[in-house]
């Protein structure tokens, strides 16, 4: 001789976010007469998910027709599952009572776990640009995933980084989780074309990790090197002086020529040439009329790059001496030119 049992055959059910969860429940008898209700959680704070007797539960459908005589299948389907639906669901048999139905027996519960994909990782770098040899921090964030287990890796140009710290929040049980990681990257002069990649692997991604990228071109500033040289005579009374601005990034650059400390001309880099490593070169010419000068002339090429303090390089032009090529000797790469006469 037995009384009714409520059987929930599945101890746990795992469902992907957006899908439908089936929670199975059968009773072993038609008696005692009374409705079945489904709850999430136990105790006084439990949440009603479905009531056979009354109420509107738009996301819930019954697996079988509960109006059929002798129906003892009280399984339900919950549609469009989100991580917020995770929890333990109890199928509870009530018996008819006056004035209210009385809870008679509960199933053992089915734990619904929701597999939710992490959001696309968002990588952000420092607010201000930094120069080579400096260490900068990149952060990577991804949200809304479940279960909690997740793997995050950092790469720079395909090479895995090791200097990073990662946190998954919250620490305790939650419907979904977030990951936050900070990686330290040492910049080099060759990093204009470099990429920092944050890679997130999760059970929901079926071996196809999500990646977030940051281009170091947004982070790096490569200061230029300057070389001022005097070119061969073009005419008896003219000397051509060039300022070669090499290996700079980004392109934003303003050049000022000074003759004996006085501004002669200011120009903005326009027709630059790009090097293989992504940096730029630019060349500015200054045509000096020697006959206009009685004394030696100090020519200064002053460059303000990307809003930074100006750097300069000078060249002494001897008026008395027969003009000849002189100046610093750093090798030039591809150069652009700019010609201007000064009278």
């Amino acid at each position: 001789e037995e009384e009714l049992q409520v059987i929930q055959p599945d101890k746990s059910v795992l469902v992907a976010a957006g899908e439908t969860a089936t929670l199975r429940c059968t009773a072993t008898s038609l008696i005692p007469v009374g409705p079945i209700q489904w709850f999430r959680g136990a105790g006084p704070g439990r949440e009603l998910i479905y009531n056979q007797k009354e109420g509107h539960f738009p996301r819930v459908t019954t697996v079988s027709d509960l109006t059929k005589r002798n129906n003892m299948d009280f399984s339900i389907r919950i549609g469009n599952i989100t991580p917020a639906d995770a929890g333990t669901y109890y199928c509870v048999k009530f018996r008819k009572g006056s004035p209210d139905d009385v809870e008679f027996k509960s199933g053992a519960g089915t734990e619904l776990s929701v597999r939710a994909k992490p959001s696309a990782p968002v990588v952000s770098g420092p607010a201000a640009r930094a120069t080579p040899q400096h260490t900068v921090s990149f952060t990577c964030e991804s949200h809304g995933f479940s279960p909690r287990d997740i793997t995050l890796k950092w790469f720079k140009n395909g090479n895995e980084l090791s200097d990073f710290q990662t946190n998954v929040d919250p620490v305790g049980e939650s419907v979904s989780y977030s990951i936050h990681s900070t990686a330290k990257v040492v910049l080099t002069r060759e990093d204009v074309h470099s990429q920092v990649i944050c890679e997130v692997a999760h059970v929901t991604l079926q071996g196809d990790p999500l990646r977030g990228t940051a281009n170091l071109s947004e982070t790096i500033r490569v200061p230029p090197t300057l070389e001022v040289t005097q070119q061969p005579v073009r005419a008896e009374n003219q000397v051509n002086v060039t300022c070669q601005v090499r290996k700079f990034y980004p392109q934003r650059l303003q050049l000022t020529w000074l003759e004996n400390g006085n501004v002669s001309r200011t120009e903005t880099a326009s027709t630059v040439t790009e090097n293989k490593d992504g940096t730029y070169n630019w060349m500015s010419w200054l045509l000096v009329n020697v006959s206009a000068h009685r004394d030696d002339v100090k020519l200064t090429c002053q460059v303000e790059h990307d809003g930074q303090p100006a750097v300069s390089k000078s060249h002494d032009l001897k008026v008395s001496a027969h003009p000849k090529e002189q100046g610093s000797n750093t090798a030039a790469e591809n150069t652009g030119s700019n010609e201007r006469n000064i009278y």
């Epitope: 037995e2 038609l30 008696i31 007469v33 005589r69 008819k96 009385v102």
Partner: antibody, heavy 120, light 108 residues
């Protein structure tokens, strides 16, 4: 048509046990809940409990727990009530009854009753 | 349990008279869960009205029922000799199923 045929009258001594039967016909026995109702002479009706023969599960009025045991035999379409430790208070007519339907709640069909007399 | 109290316990009426008996519940009963039976001496109860006002099969139209909540009644519009019996109300709103103490109708 639905019929519930109950066993004949019983005369038993105090302290003894008795088992009375209710044979169902005219419907699928295992699909319907059967109840047992007690009526003492000149008194009202008291619901004892019910049995669902489909899974041989029972539900009792608290007042009759320990006194009555309901069973069923699907092969013979018969329900039984066993009463133990009998006293004169158990002397009554015992009816089996079936609801019109599972969710009807009214006894559409009744057996003719079995008179139980407990006497030394 | 939901106690059903019937009144009067006994009544004696003349043929053709209108009769009303009441059934009062200690807890509210859904109208679909209140039923009436007729029991003649030495016989089993016979279903009379189910769900407050629905006549069971073969029951004459002179019988009617009404009520809601905790108060229900059974009316016989014009009593006939065959109506002499005890009438019981029964609730199916909550366990245990209970019956009223009965109203015994005697024909004068």
């Amino acid at each position: 048509q639905v019929q519930l045929q109950q066993s004949g009258p019983e005369l038993v001594k105090p302290g003894a046990s008795v088992k009375m039967s209710c044979k169902a016909s005219g419907y699928t026995f295992s699909e319907y809940v059967l109840s047992w109702v007690k009526q003492r002479t000149g008194q009202g009706l008291e619901w004892i409990g019910e049995i669902y023969p489909g899974t041989i599960t029972t539900y009792y009025n608290e007042k009759f727990k320990g006194k009555a045991t309901l069973t069923a035999d699907k092969s013979s379409n018969t329900a039984y009530i066993q009463l133990t430790s009998l006293t004169s208070e158990d002397s009554a007519v015992y009816f089996c009854g079936r609801f019109y339907d599972y969710d009807g709640g009214w006894f559409a069909y009744w057996g003719q009753g079995t008179l139980l007399t407990v006497s030394a | 349990e939901n106690v059903l109290t019937q009144s009067p316990e006994k009544m004696a009426v003349s043929l053709g008279q209108k009769v009303t008996m009441t059934c009062s519940a200690s807890s509210s009963v859904s109208s679909s869960d209140l039923h009436w039976y007729q029991q003649k001496s030495g016989a089993s109860p016979k279903p009379l009205i189910h769900g407050t006002s629905n006549l069971a099969s073969g029951v004459p139209a002179r019988f009617s029922g009404s009520g809601s909540g905790t108060s229900y009644s059974l009316t016989i519009s014009s009593v006939e000799a065959e109506d002499a019996a005890t009438y019981y109300c029964q609730q199916w709103s909550g366990y245990p199923w209970t019956f009223g103490g009965g109203t015994n109708l005697e024909i004068k």
